[in-house]
């Protein structure tokens, strides 16, 4: 039994880091493998992660972490019974994938303005809470070409756009994702999308 693709890990910079790897053949990850991880820290203790299958030869492990700070460094040991298959390390702050924003809501009752709001996925005491920026994706269900991205570079989790920038009388969907420049993170997954019917009063034409 050998590791074909070494574990790569990403952290949500809160409580979970996810490691994925591939074996050289079909493997029952949960019965055959264990991933041990330990904070490089005086008097810390090793923890065991039981991996799940992720495709035939792929494995994934969700490492539970009691908070994360920038100095954290973990040792990782992948075991098959008594055999050490791979040894490595992982610094969560260098491999951050933020959590996806939630509770995306479209408020359509604000005088021809669409107000989109969502929730910051981090609690106020987490470092990323004040460092997230967002991308909002809006698209038409009827017209695949009607697809736009709005970059929200301020901290407030909201976006205002004029309803008239979208077509009237048709349905739209929106979703939002986050990233943090301070840790050069990857983008989060997209939030679940939300749907609304866009309608607004056309201004009277004056002759």
């Amino acid at each position: 039994m050998k590791v074909l693709q070494e574990p790569t890990c990403v952290s949500d910079y809160m409580s979970i880091s996810t490691c994925e790897w591939k074996m050289n053949g079909p493997t029952n990850c949960s019965t055959e493998l264990r991933l041990l991880y330990q904070l490089v820290f005086l008097l810390s203790e090793a923890h065991t992660c039981i991996p799940e299958n992720n495709g035939g030869a792929g494995c994934v492990c969700h490492l539970l972490m009691d908070d994360v700070v920038s100095a954290d460094n973990y040792t990782l040991d992948l075991w098959a019974g008594q055999q050490l298959l791979w040894k490595g390390s992982f610094k969560p702050s260098e491999h951050v994938k933020p959590r996806a924003p939630g509770n995306l809501t479209v408020h359509t009752n604000v005088s021809d303005t669409l107000l989109l709001t969502w929730s910051n996925p981090y609690p106020p005491d987490n470092y990323l809470y004040n460092h997230l920026t967002y991308a909002v994706n809006i698209w038409s269900e009827n017209d695949p070409a009607d697809f736009r991205i709005y970059n929200v570079t301020y901290l407030e989790p909201s976006l205002r756009i004029a309803a008239s920038t979208l077509k009237s009388g048709i349905s739209y969907r929106a979703r939002v994702r986050a990233w943090a420049q301070c840790y050069n993170t990857t983008w989060s997954e997209w939030s679940p999308s939300t749907k609304w019917h866009n309608s607004y009063r056309e201004p009277f034409e004056q002759h």
């Epitope: 005086l42 203790e45 700070v69 100095a71």
Partner: antibody, heavy 120, light 108 residues
């Protein structure tokens, strides 16, 4: 209420031994690394020794290595420090302290301390 | 072994002023953690800051920590009468634990 209560301090002659105890209440001892920190009269804080939550690993400052032994009894919620070959420079208030990995070594609960005096 | 040096040894300020306490490590500490404690006469120390910049439970937001590498700072934005005490920095790393010698913050 979360509390640490040290006992076992006293006056001892140079070369003698003492066993300090620390009774924990209001929390589960086995979830925390535990430590002893001392403070000589009018001086600053000095780290003495620590033990991991399960007791599987220990650490000693160079000044006490080979003379002091830290141990714990998690079911009884008690921490110990066995001190032998005591010297005058071991005279201090000894604090029992807890730390959780979440606090990255920050010691969030301290006992009120027990005084050890080494003198002839 | 890393040595922590705190400065100044004594800081004399008045209530309402801003206090800046320094803690310098003898070598860079990328994978270690810095904490700050407050100790009043006859009392055990109290944890203020852990992980360089995170406030411990119940600590007022006038206390803040910052720094990296070898230089770390505890800032008290607006001194209250109860803040006058001795402050210690502490380094907790992969192989050792060390305290600074302390800074006494006294009323001017």
């Amino acid at each position: 209420e979360v509390q640490l209560l040290e006992s076992g301090g006293g006056l001892v002659q140079p070369g003698g031994s003492l066993r300090l105890s620390c009774a924990a209440s209001g929390f589960t001892l086995s979830s925390y690394a535990m430590h002893w920190v001392r403070q000589a009269p009018g001086k600053g804080l000095e780290y003495v020794s620590g033990i991991s939550p399960s007791g599987s690993s220990t650490y000693y400052a160079n000044s006490v290595k080979g003379r002091f032994t830290i141990s714990r009894d998690n079911p009884k919620n008690t921490l110990f420090l066995q001190m032998s070959s005591l010297r005058a420079e071991d005279t201090a208030v000894y604090y029992c302290v807890r730390s959780k990995v979440r606090y990255r070594g920050g010691m969030d609960v301290w006992g009120q301390g027990t005084t050890v005096t080494v003198s002839s | 072994e890393i040595v922590l040096t705190q400065s100044p040894g004594t800081l004399s300020l008045s209530p309402g002023e801003r206090a800046t306490l320094s803690c310098r490590a003898s070598q860079g500490i990328s994978s270690a953690y810095l904490a700050w404690y407050q100790q009043k006469p006859g009392q055990a120390p109290r944890l203020l800051i852990y992980g360089t910049s995170r406030r411990a439970t119940g600590i007022p937001d006038r206390f803040s920590g910052s720094g990296s590498g070898t230089d770390f700072t505890l800032t008290i934005s607006r001194l209250e009468p109860e803040d006058f005490a001795v402050y210690y920095c502490q380094l907790y790393g992969a192989t050792s634990v060390t305290f600074g010698q302390g800074t006494k913050l006294e009323i001017k």
